[in-house]
């Protein structure tokens, strides 16, 4: 998916009211300095095509995280203020429901989920360019 | 300390694929980073080709993204290169690298692939 | 695409000396540049990102400055290792990351 056409602002306000929160809650009890961010993101478009997938695809150690508070309202935000996302997706959410497995968060989620907060707080950056 | 080394054939056909594979040491190319490549035609500048990030994400520099596959085998550790259609002007010394996707802090030592029938 | 331009082609100075390169963009990428070494028959290495943070192990002689579309890179006092050429990288946007042709410096 492209995400150049989203409403950037708007996804931003979306991470900032409620992401942001939710991705500190699955955070709780963790220091901040406790793992390193090894990516980063370019642009907003960048960004969010990093976000995405990092969101939503299983990696070693970490099956899903797709079911998280933070991820649901994820995919809420890109679905309404992506045009055309929601249908991208179609494909990949069946596919997910047939592997999708017990929540456990692991060390290697919570080390997933800090990378995802350095990416959204990239995406924030105020002179991160759109595109 | 991470090491990178690229192997693959140092001559390739025009019109045929060319494919490299970088191998990775003293790191696992799934735990973090992006995995990336870069090429330089002798005595002329560097170009980006791609990256494949650690989570699967796959970028490619859009005027080469018609040719190129970048994929990778956790297992071994390693990340390849496919460039279909090549050319002479394809000719280059490829580098794998090591990236936060933004820009690149570890390399391999590069390879030459010359590109001639 | 965003076009690097490297200046001088080539510097000619002496050992002990202060070197001076510039790398120009031609649209704004705010601080997002690096600048990389590279000697002959090696890799390139990385010296600055987020154009004046120096990268782990460089030495305090190599410095990095500027944002928008004028960066600099300064080598407060040449040492016998430093003659190389330099790069210059942009990655403000994606996925069109490039490179400056490169700044030869040379011993006099």
């Known amino acids: 998916y492209d995400f150049t056409n989203c409403d950037f602002e708007k996804i931003k306000a979306a991470y900032l009211s409620t992401i942001s929160k939710d991705l500190i809650t699955y955070m709780s009890g963790t220091k901040s300095t406790e793992f390193n961010n090894t990516v980063s993101c370019s642009n907003r478009p960048h960004c969010l095509t990093e976000i995405q997938s990092l969101t939503f695809n299983p990696t070693a150690g970490c099956a899903s995280l797709a079911k998280e508070m933070f991820a649901m309202k994820t995919k809420a935000a890109l679905a309404i203020w992506c045009p055309g996302y929601s249908e991208t997706q179609i494909n990949a959410t069946q596919a997910m429901k047939k592997r999708r497995k017990r929540k456990v968060t692991t060390n290697k989620c919570l080390e997933q989920v800090s990378q995802l907060q350095g990416l959204w707080r990239r995406f924030n950056r105020p002179l991160l360019k759109q595109q | 300390q991470v090491q990178l080394q690229e192997s693959g054939p140092g001559l390739v056909k025009p019109s045929e694929t060319l494919s490299l594979t970088c191998t990775v040491s003293?790191?696992?190319?799934?735990?973090?980073?992006?995995w990336s490549w870069i090429r330089q035609p002798p005595g002329k500048g560097l170009e980006w080709i791609g990256y494949?990030?650690?989570?699967?994400?796959?970028s490619y520099n859009p005027s080469l993204k018609s040719r190129v596959t970048i994929s990778r085998d956790t297992s071994k550790n390693q990340f390849s290169l496919k460039l279909s259609s090549v050319t002479a002007a394809d000719t280059a010394v490829y580098y794998c690298?090591?990236?936060?996707?933004?820009?690149?802090?570890?390399w391999g030592q590069g390879t030459l692939v010359t590109v001639s029938s | 695409e965003i076009v690097l331009t490297q200046s001088p082609a080539t510097l000619s100075l002496s050992p002990g000396e202060r070197a001076t390169l510039s790398c120009r963009a031609s649209?704004?990428?705010?601080?997002?540049l690096a600048w990389y070494q590279q000697k002959p028959g090696q890799a390139p290495r990385l010296l600055i990102y987020?154009?004046?943070s120096r990268a782990t192990g460089i030495p305090a002689r190599f410095s990095g400055s500027g944002s928008g579309t004028d960066f600099t890179l300064t080598i407060s006092s040449l040492e016998p290792e430093d003659f190389a050429v330099y790069y210059c990288?942009?990655?403000?946007?994606?996925?069109?990351?490039?490179f400056g042709q490169g700044t030869k410096v040379e011993i006099k």
């Open positions: 690298a090591r990236t936060n996707l933004l820009y690149f802090d570890s």
């Open positions: 003293g790191y696992s190319i799934s735990s973090g980073y992006g």
């Open positions: 494949i990030s650690y989570y699967g994400s796959i």
């Open positions: 649209q704004s990428v705010s601080n997002n």
């Open positions: 987020d154009a004046s």
């Open positions: 990288q942009q990655y403000s946007d994606w996925p069109q990351y490039t």
